[in-house]
């Protein structure tokens, strides 16, 4: 799979659309996960509604929102209030039982507003921190809230 590179500006929203074969993936939930390493686990961020027929409803985890148009074959993920810590390699996945099929790999690059002071000490303060599904969000005085990524895929 080729990797799609998307750029977003810190503080703004970034919308990701992953298309898929609606017939092939009929009845399957979709998920958005962050790849923790090149060959490492992909940590679930958010997944669509547990009832497939309700997949069109927006499901939110922290600042990440997912919704699935199952007829059109498009799952849309919105990363709200983008922060530097949101940068990374993600996957759109189609879930079948305990298995996950990768629909698309997305590299998210977060750009700082050049009009802002480029002091790294002030770059990483989120108004709204994204937590990770099944993960613990630790609060600290550092630039981002520390998000724990469990080692399981």
């Amino acid at each position: 799979l080729n990797t799609t590179v998307l750029q977003g500006m810190a503080g703004q929203s970034l919308r990701v659309s992953c298309t898929y074969d609606a017939l092939k993936h009929w009845g399957r939930r979709k998920a958005w996960c962050r790849q923790l390493g090149e060959e490492g686990p992909c940590q679930r961020v958010v997944s669509t509604h547990g009832v497939w027929l309700l997949a069109f409803l927006k499901k939110r985890n922290g600042s990440t929102v997912i919704a699935d148009d199952t007829l059109a074959g498009t799952v849309t993920i919105t990363l709200k209030n983008l922060q530097a810590g949101d940068a990374g390699l993600y996957q759109c996945q189609s879930l079948r039982g305990r298995e996950a099929e990768v629909l698309q790999k997305v590299l998210v690059e977060v750009l700082e507003d050049p009009l802002d002071d480029q002091d790294a000490g002030d770059l990483w303060v989120p108004e709204e921190s994204s937590s990770f599904e099944g993960a613990q969000v630790e609060h600290s005085t550092s630039r981002n809230q520390e998000t724990s990524f469990p080692p399981t895929s």
Partner: antibody
């Protein structure tokens, strides 16, 4: 095979300038954040600077902010570090590193290039 | 900035020993920690990322654990090639700070 090859190190007087280069191969350079990490003789590791895959945003350690500039040329698969107003405490081996997808850990390292600042 | 403190600073052990190196963060860092190995005159090599994930090609005798402020790197059975200096690093949030290193020497 991922390879990072630094060049440009050498002896420079305090207040002088030096430009380090890092030639990358074995991976899609434009898809990765890159960084410089240094190590003073007999000392530990110190992160110096990072930049995003397009080079659109850069980050610096307080110790080099305003003096060093990180940049990249994705068409040449090359990372740069422009070092100005060099001080004795900048003497170190400078490593070019690949940063995993903005996560701040460095999965591949070059062999390093020695920068010596001395009069 | 968050400080990372390793202990011990140096350690003598024998081939076959089980060795544990600890890293303490001055503030909670979740599980955002990496470990590196460095041999004299060589560049560091990534061993572990996000506390417990072994990097490609790293032997299974290396393992990492911990969360919050206290972390450990364990080598279950030391091999001759494991004698080196080990560094922990706080990841995910800038600035990326390293521990001062733990030198593992042959007893």
């Amino acid at each position: 095979e991922v390879q990072l090859l630094e060049s440009g190190g050498g002896l420079v007087q305090p207040g002088g300038s030096l430009r380090l280069s890092c030639a990358a191969s074995g991976f899609t350079f434009s898809n990765y954040y890159m960084a410089w990490v240094r190590q003073a003789p007999g000392k530990g590791l110190e992160w110096v600077s990072s930049l995003t895959n397009s080079g659109g945003s850069t980050y610096y350690a307080d110790s080099v902010k305003g003096r060093f500039t990180i940049s990249r040329d994705n068409s040449k698969n090359t990372l740069y570090l422009q070092m100005n107003s060099l001080r004795a405490e900048d003497t170190a081996v400078y490593y070019c590193t690949r940063e995993w997808a903005g996560s701040g850990y460095f999965d591949y390292w070059g062999q390093g290039t020695l920068v010596t600042v001395s009069s | 900035d968050i400080q990372m403190t390793q202990s011990p600073s140096s350690l003598s052990a024998s081939v076959g020993d089980r060795v544990t190196i600890t890293c303490k963060a001055s503030q909670n860092v979740g599980n955002n920690l990496a470990w590196y190995q460095q041999k004299p005159g060589k560049a560091p090599k990534l061993l572990i990322y996000y506390t417990s994930n072994r990097f490609t090609g790293v032997p299974s005798r290396f393992s990492g654990s911990g969360s919050g402020t206290d972390f450990t790197l364990t080598i279950s059975s030391l091999q001759p090639e494991d004698f080196a200096t080990y560094y922990c690093q706080r990841i995910y949030n800038s600035p990326w700070t390293f521990g001062q290193g733990t030198k593992l020497e042959i007893k």
